[in-house]
């Protein structure tokens, strides 16, 4: 502990200028004081001033008022510092002396004489309030006040609690009157060394080094560090824990970048046609009558379906068509005949057969001719056999499809992929993805094109279940399981009913 007993001398009265022994001072009593502070004694005794002692210079002659003085010689109040826990009780002896000698250091002069003395014993609590008193004897009167205060940085009832305000990384606080710490705004903890993070900052996933901050731990993001960061490259997926990539509905693959539901996501089929998914990014459009093209985007003329029979000619109208019938035929589609076999209605060598007791007929056409009267040469392109926008061309009795770039096959039904040039080395499997081909590598190889030989084979331990194929070089775990139909999971360990058209890459 550490504190100061302060004694303020206010007025000393010795009107007759007398000493304690009854003699008078000549020319007057040049007065200084000796103060002795010690532990409480019921009966004050001589002996060491255990709490401290102090002397003053000459403060006046006979009777005088003592002015406050903050520094130098004759300081008032008098200071009696102590370096222990203040016990709350004390004994104080104040002696007034006359000196014939030096004003500044009368204590050292020979021939000093006692004028009077007072003794105070009692209790005194630490505090800023001065206790005022006055002591009289037959010849003199002394007015004074006193108190005990704690030294700088000491607090509490007995000045025993050391506290120094600080604002560094070992504490951010001020000191309360009792010596306890009062944290500065934004700080908490026993030593006020823990910052109070931004309100709502996630307790586990965020932290701070100064108040109102929220620094995210690896794998977390957002103002409050409550959003996980998905796996790098995760396209159509989310996470519940960091570095995860849980695919949104209709997406698959390690990075959820393989579209399993192209129809729903992109609606590629136009004009009311039906869209059917067929694996990653694959789909087919089934057109309504009157439309053609890969996406059924091409509208056919209303006459394109050749609705007029028996050689009738078709004329397009705004929302319909009109059949101009040849002689001997009538009806919306010229389907009704006024002719009989006697009129030789069958062309191109067709045979006439009478029907309805000769009131009508039917023609049996030779090869390569069709129509009610065998009037039409067979057009093998009528059924729109060419897929993906291919152009149909009649070649005598047969027809061929002229495919658009990127398609092949008899009906242009095959997509020529980036994988056609076999970019994957060492037997890697090629997958056409939006941004180009991706190789899944066999055991022992990795890299974009399976060109890197792996010295440590992550697949050697056989981590994939249920007959899945193991590949390395595609994931941070060093291996990837390509699941067979009916199984999912990072190791293909979970059975589930999945469409057989797309093998899951776990």
């Amino acid at each position: 502990g550490s504190g100061i007993f302060q004694l303020r001398l206010q007025e000393f009265v010795n009107q007759r200028g007398m000493l304690a022994n009854g003699q008078s001072c000549e020319p007057g009593c040049r007065t200084f004081f000796r103060i002795c502070l010690k532990h409480f004694q019921a009966t004050f005794s001589e002996g060491p001033c255990t709490f401290g002692n102090v002397s003053t210079p000459v403060l006046g002659t006979n009777s005088f008022v003592v002015r406050d003085k903050n520094s130098g010689s004759g300081r008032n109040p008098l200071q009696l510092p102590f370096n222990f826990t203040w016990p709350g009780t004390f004994s104080l002896n104040i002696q007034a002396w006359h000196t014939p000698g030096d004003d500044l250091r009368p204590e050292t002069s020979p021939g000093n004489s006692l004028i009077s003395q007072i003794i105070i014993q009692g209790s005194l609590a630490v505090g800023k309030i001065w206790r005022t008193d006055e002591q009289n004897d037959t010849l003199t009167r002394l007015s004074y006040s006193y108190r005990v205060i704690c030294s700088d940085n000491y607090y509490g009832e007995s000045c025993s609690r050391l506290c120094k305000k600080r604002d560094d990384h070992f504490g951010h606080y001020e000191c309360q009157p009792d010596g306890s710490l009062s944290c500065l705004p934004g700080w908490t903890g026993k030593y006020c060394d823990q910052p109070i993070c931004l309100s709502g900052c996630h307790e586990q996933n965020g932290y701070c080094s100064k108040p109102d901050e929220c620094i995210c731990r690896p794998g977390w993001q957002g103002r409050l560090c409550n959003e996980c960061i998905p796996h790098n490259g995760c396209r159509h997926g989310t996470c519940s824990i960091p570095w995860q990539c849980a695919c949104d509905e209709g997406w698959g693959g390690l990075f959820c970048d393989q579209d399993l539901n192209y129809c729903t996501h992109h609606s590629p089929c136009k004009n009311g046609s039906t869209c059917s998914n067929s694996g990653p990014k694959g789909y087919t459009c089934t057109c309504l009558p009157g439309y053609t093209g890969e996406h059924c985007e091409l509208g056919l003329s209303k006459c394109a379906s050749n609705p007029c029979r028996n050689g009738g000619s078709c004329k397009d109208q705004e929302n319909s068509y009109h059949c101009l019938c040849p002689p001997g035929y009538y009806g919306q589609h010229c389907e009704h005949s006024t002719l009989t076999c006697a009129d030789s209605p069958c062309f191109n060598g067709g045979s006439c057969r009478e029907r309805n007791q000769g009131s009508s007929y039917a023609c049996e056409c030779p090869p390569n001719f069709t129509g009610s009267n065998c009037e039409k040469k067979v057009d093998r392109c009528t059924s729109n056999p060419c897929a993906n926008g291919g152009q149909c061309q009649n070649r005598g009795p047969s027809r061929t499809c002229r495919c658009r770039p990127g398609f092949t096959g008899t009906h242009c039904e095959l997509h020529i992929s980036d994988c056609a040039r076999s970019p994957c080395a060492h037997g890697g499997t090629c997958h056409d993805l939006e941004n180009g081909p991706v190789c899944t590598c066999p055991a022992g190889f990795s890299g974009r094109r399976c060109e890197v030989r792996i010295t440590h084979d992550a697949c050697a331990s056989g981590p994939c279940f249920n007959g899945a194929t193991c590949y390395t070089g595609l994931s941070p775990n060093n291996f990837v399981c390509n699941c067979p139909y009916g199984f999912v999971g990072s190791r293909c360990e979970f059975p589930v009913g999945l469409p057989p058209s797309f093998p899951w890459v776990a």
Partner: antibody
Framework: EVQLQESGPGLVKPSETLSLTCTVS??????????WGWIRQPPGKGLEWIGD???????YYNPSLKSRVTISVDTSKNQFSLKLSSVTAADTAVYYC?????????????WGQGTLVTVSS | SYELTQPPSVSVSPGQTASITCSGQ??????ASWYQQKPGQSPVLVIY???KRPSGIPERFSGSNSGDTATLTISGTQPMDEADYYC?????????FGYGTKVTVL
């Protein structure tokens, strides 16, 4: 009982980077009661505080060295490290790692045995 | 930058009291620590927060700090106390050591 052990090369060439690691055993570096510091002592001279770090990664550096010093922490390994770049012969010293206690007002109650690093070509 | 000044050396007879001072501007408003370092050894904390002793440090080591001066007192000095002594304080977020005092037990 907590012990600290410095490790790293004893010889570094001028203009290169000095790298030291302090491994803490017998206690967790993630304690909220301590900072982990580096102090150096050139031969025959006094102690110089370099800087310290908290387990969260908060760092404090001596302004006279700040431009060249990096202190980092790896809680998974219970280690913290010092990097001092562009060294000169004046950086030759015994380098100590130490534990500074928040309850001790910043006093360093545990020290490593020190490792002498000489900067010379 | 903040500086702490110590006398380069202090001599003391066995059994006597050695006082080592450490001066710095308004040092009394900061907490002072003291370290003992013997030749070829790491420093050892002997006083923290001006006057507190870590466990294992003998009672003959005591400290005080007020005004501009912190003092380490070794009462009843023993030959084993011969060592270099460093004061240390924190100036904001920077640790500052005194230049060190060599205590010789005569």
């Amino acid at each position: 009982e907590v012990q600290l052990q410095e490790s790293g090369p004893g010889l570094v060439k001028p203009s290169e980077t000095l790298s030291l690691t302090c491994t803490v055993s017998g206690g967790s570096i993630s304690s909220s009661s301590y900072y982990w510091g580096w102090i150096r002592q050139p031969p025959g001279k006094g102690l110089e505080w370099i800087g310290d770090i908290y387990y969260t990664g908060s760092t404090y550096y001596n302004p006279s060295l700040k431009s060249r010093v990096t202190i980092s922490v790896d809680t998974s390994k219970n280690q913290f490290s010092l990097k001092l770049s562009s060294v000169t012969a004046a950086d030759t010293a015994v380098y100590y790692c130490a534990r500074e206690g928040v309850p001790l007002g910043g006093g360093a109650d545990k020290w490593g045995q020190g490792t002498l690093v000489t900067v010379s070509s | 930058s903040y500086e702490l000044t110590q006398p380069p050396s202090v001599s003391v007879s066995p059994g006597q009291t050695a006082s080592i001072t450490c001066s710095g501007q308004r040092l009394g408003d900061k907490y002072a620590s003291w370290y003992q370092q013997k030749p070829g050894q790491s420093p050892v904390l002997v006083i923290y927060e001006d006057s507190k002793r870590p466990s294992g440090i003998p009672e003959r080591f005591s400290g005080s700090n007020s005004g501009d001066t912190a003092t380490l007192t070794i009462s009843g000095t023993q030959p084993m106390d011969e060592a270099d002594y460093y004061c240390q304080a924190w100036d904001r977020d920077t640790g500052v050591f005194g230049y060190g005092t060599k205590v010789t037990v005569l």
